[in-house]
């Protein structure tokens, strides 16, 4: 079922080079460094899985220790176009150019990649995250302005031979880091052109991608301890379930959201947390080393699997919702935010999943793939868990369709 | 909702005095303790007193012998009396108040609540 031995050569074994090449923290982003131009610059970039450009800070900026310029490279070469990106909350904006990229640990290779050179931004680079830009992991499809500006993994693909695939391992630390140990601390891995097989442990299970423009996927089931939902399973990727790197949060379907939070409150009604601590605004605390993890109860996503009527499913503890925070009046105590909240754009299975896993992003082969992450923080009880198959049918009815709004269905 | 509502700051010329108070309101926990942190420019946010519910306190070496922390537990609010002020008490000064969710109101599980802040400017 879990597809291991079709894989084709090279796409196997070990990228020796390319392990704990990630920094970060969930709350802030996890970054990669890459270096741009000619002379090289090195500069911090943000993987971002739910985004398709590649953009990077290029003037001066009270959060950036340092900035693309694009002045100092004989290879930048000019788009002559800008691009213009808002977020419910925030923005940037800036020129297209191209230059050359490579990724000191990563593949050998340099390409010649689209570069947006962010030249005014709000409430976009966040103070002490240690990173500079954005790489945009996804398709074309919803790249800025618009699908015509290639991605920078299709750049590398087409311009190189590397396999049409890359893997994340996102190691949360289970505890709060200041700047000096977030610096210092591994955060995980990103391996292009392949699987190591060292990240994870036990079988990968795979699931169909849906719609190649974001990751796409498709949830048929979920459960709170072992408790179903009981929803129609639409409402579970209303309006679209996407696996996104960039997104600290699992975030879920206003429906969805208030009746996993009603469970998860049932489960852990040993203890009556204030109503902002539900709504990820406050912080709850234990004496140091108290943290009761076992009156939380555990949440699995049941996701389309590769053969028709099957399904997996991926387990996750509260070491992964459950987000470790500090401040200066907590600093003695464990302190939290729950990272599970409300979204009014689908499902994002953000950093609290996909530090629970190892994430294969199979291009080639339209898939995605999770085991049991190696890096995962969990206790003497309870672990992260990938299981399957079980028996789903008529999973093709939990897709939503979003009504087309283009010049065509416009036609009368 | 809870909300703490901070006062007493203001300007004072060094060696004079002045009173904070925070009163919180909107919970039914129990208050486990209430604590006072100021942060100056640039600086780092640091505690300045705090005051437990069993009417412990404790200060911060840079205010001994010259603040005083109380509380009025009827009123859920929390003062800081503050003498012979100098120019470095200058700051920003925040009230943080902890709230017990641990079963039965206590402790062991707490919340906890950021005031917006009071200035304090003292001028040689």
């Known amino acids: 079922e879990t597809d291991e031995e079709s894989e084709e050569p090279g796409r196997r074994g070990s990228f020796v080079e390319m392990v704990d090449n990630l920094r970060g923290k969930s709350g802030q982003g996890y970054y990669v460094e890459m270096t741009v131009g000619s002379p090289p610059q090195t500069l911090n970039i943000l993987v971002d899985t739910g985004s398709s450009n590649f953009a990077v800070g290029a003037a001066p900026h009270p959060f950036l220790h340092r900035y693309y310029q694009r002045q100092l490279s004989s290879t930048y070469r000019d788009l002559r176009k800008g691009v213009y990106v808002p977020y419910t909350q925030g923005k940037w904006e800036g020129e297209l150019g191209t230059d050359l990229v490579s990724i000191p640990h990563g593949p050998n290779v340099t390409v010649r990649a689209n570069i947006a050179a962010i030249t005014e931004s709000d409430k976009f680079f966040i103070n002490g995250s240690n990173w500079e830009g954005i790489l945009g992991l996804a398709y074309a499809e919803i790249a800025r302005p618009d699908d015509s500006l290639e991605p920078f993994f299709d750049s590398l693909v087409k311009q190189t031979h590397i396999p049409n695939i890359f893997s994340l391992q996102l190691c949360g630390a289970g505890f709060p880091l200041n700047q000096t140990e977030a610096l210092a601390s591994v955060g995980g891995s990103m391996i292009i052109g392949g699987i190591d097989h060292s990240l994870y442990t036990g079988s990968l299970w795979y699931t169909p991608i849906r719609r190649e423009w974001y990751y796409e996927v498709i949830i048929v089931r979920v459960e709170i301890n072992g408790q179903d939902l009981k929803m129609d399973c639409k409402e579970y990727n209303y309006d679209k379930s996407i696996v996104d790197s960039g997104t600290t949060n699992l975030r879920l379907p206003k429906k969805v959201f208030e009746a996993a939070v009603k469970s998860i409150k049932a489960a852990s009604s040993t203890e009556k947390f204030p109503d902002g601590f539900w709504l990820g605004e406050q912080l709850v605390c234990w004496q140091a080393g108290t943290t009761p993890w076992n009156i939380f109860p555990v949440i699995s996503l049941y996701l389309m699997g590769e053969v028709t009527n099957q399904s997996f499913r991926i387990t996750i503890l509260p070491q992964q919702y459950l987000r470790p925070v500090e401040d200066v009046a907590t600093s003695q105590d464990d302190c939290y935010k729950f990272a599970v909240s409300q979204s009014s754009t689908g499902t994002v299975m953000g950093a609290v999943i996909m530090e629970g896993f190892y994430v294969v992003f199979d291009r080639a082969r339209k898939r995605i793939g999770f085991a049991v992450s190696a890096c995962h923080v969990h206790d003497e009880f309870r672990t992260a868990a990938v299981e399957g198959p079980f028996v789903t049918a008529d999973m093709e009815d939990c897709g939503y369709n979003i009504p087309q709004t283009d010049e065509s269905t416009l036609m009368t | 909702q809870v909300q703490l509502q901070e006062s007493g700051g203001g300007s004072v010329q060094a060696g004079g005095f002045l009173r904070l108070s925070c009163a919180a309101s909107g919970y039914t926990y129990s208050t486990c303790s209430m604590a006072w942190y100021r942060q100056a420019p640039g600086k780092e946010r640091e505690l300045v007193s705090s005051i437990r519910n069993d009417g412990s306190t404790a200060y911060a070496d840079s205010v001994k012998g010259r603040f005083t922390i109380s509380q009025d537990n009827a009123k859920n609010t929390v003062y800081l009396q503050m003498n012979s002020l100098k120019p470095e008490d200058t700051a920003m000064y925040y009230c943080?108040?902890?709230?017990?969710?641990?079963?039965?109101?206590?402790?062991?599980?707490?919340?906890?609540?950021w005031g917006e802040g009071t200035q304090v400017t003292v001028s040689s």
């Open positions: 943080n108040i902890r709230i017990g969710v641990g079963p039965g109101g206590t402790c062991s599980i707490y919340a906890p609540y």
